[in-house]
């Protein structure tokens, strides 16, 4: 399965926090959304193989790594001025 | 900053095996990414020659396959290169390298060089 | 395996000149995933490799911005917009798309 932790996070102002996705499942392909209340997904970074990832819809302020096919970790920086929202990983073959 | 050193004998006996140890630095090669060996060749032509994964899965160059093994040690943190039944054209500089991250394989990261000489 | 074919060989030119390096490759580059993994890279003797655009057109870390990188398929460009002294070197297109991971030949930029 896919695991996301953790479930809930505060972050102090000017702080960097990450937020970890691994699975097991085999997959290639890694994906970051962000939701906010009463909005739809929105794409923040997704990842199609290990060491390669590319920018989505609303990256400004959030940077990723994908050292490994299993894990793609997202850190939400003290450039992100408004982090408060749903995060939400997702994988694909 | 990831750092990479090669070590290993500098002439090899024909029909012999090459053997080649690559100590990294900075990173933990379990940690993730692609342990690679490449090759310049006299004429300046490069070769790439394999990797080891950092779950310790190998991708090899299809011309070498029947000669190359790469392997690591994690308790070193090292990967090593051996090549068997060498010829004076496995003559070359050998390189470790590994990729620069978010680059897809390109990699970035190579260690000094170790010149490689095959002859009696 | 991909044959990187570079053109030219060899290459003499002038500080402050514009020089375009050509690469193709005997089959496209495009991965699976819609990426293109040509690589350009830097060699000056005596020395490793340094890599300067990856990704076809993305300029790494530190490299000026007279390097830029272009094209799409078989066919792509390193281009130096203004010749500066540190830039004679020898330089190399490579491509990780496929297994084996192949480099061109080399293109040796020598100062006229």
């Known amino acids: 399965g896919i695991t996301q932790s953790p479930k809930y996070l505060f972050r102090k102002e000017g702080q960097n926090v990450t937020l970890s996705c691994e699975q097991n499942l085999n997959h290639d392909a890694m994906y970051w959304y962000r939701q906010d209340p009463g909005q739809g997904l929105r794409l923040i970074y997704y990842s199609q193989i290990v060491n390669d990832f590319q920018k989505g819809d609303i990256a400004e302020g959030y940077s990723v790594s994908r050292e490994k096919k299993e894990s793609f970790p997202l850190t939400v920086t003290s450039a992100q001025k408004n982090p408060t929202a749903f995060y939400l990983c997702a994988s694909s073959i | 900053q990831v750092q990479l050193q090669e070590s290993g004998p500098g002439l090899v006996k024909p029909s012999e095996t090459l053997s080649l140890t690559c100590t990294v630095s900075?990173?933990?090669?379990?940690?993730?990414?692609?342990w690679n060996w490449i090759r310049q060749f006299p004429g300046k032509g490069l070769e790439w020659m394999g990797y080891i994964s950092y779950d310790g899965s190998n991708n090899y160059n299809p011309s070498l396959k029947s000669r190359i093994t790469i392997s690591r040690d994690t308790s070193k943190n090292q990967f090593s290169l051996k090549l068997s039944s060498v010829t004076a054209a496995d003559t070359a500089v050998y390189y470790c390298?590994?990729?620069?991250?978010?680059?897809?394989?390109?990699?970035?990261?190579w260690g000094q060089g170790t010149t490689v000489t095959v002859s009696s | 395996d991909i044959q990187m074919t570079q053109s030219p060989s060899s290459l003499s030119a002038s500080v402050g000149d514009r020089v375009t390096i050509t690469c193709r490759s005997s089959?496209?580059?495009?991965?699976?995933?819609?990426?293109?993994?040509l690589h350009w890279y830097q060699q000056k003797p005596g020395k490793a490799p340094k890599l300067l655009i990856y990704k076809v057109s993305n300029r790494f870390s530190g490299v000026p911005s007279r390097f830029s990188g272009s094209g799409s398929g078989t066919d792509f460009t390193l281009t130096i917009s203004s010749l500066q002294p540190e830039d004679f070197a020898t330089y190399y297109c490579s491509q990780s798309t496929h297994v084996p991971f192949t480099f061109g030949q080399g293109t040796k930029l020598e100062i006229k």
């Open positions: 089959q496209s580059l495009v991965h699976s995933n819609k990426n293109t993994y």
């Open positions: 900075g990173y933990s090669i379990t940690s993730g990414y692609f």
């Open positions: 390298a590994s990729p620069s991250p978010g680059t897809g394989y390109a990699v970035d990261y």
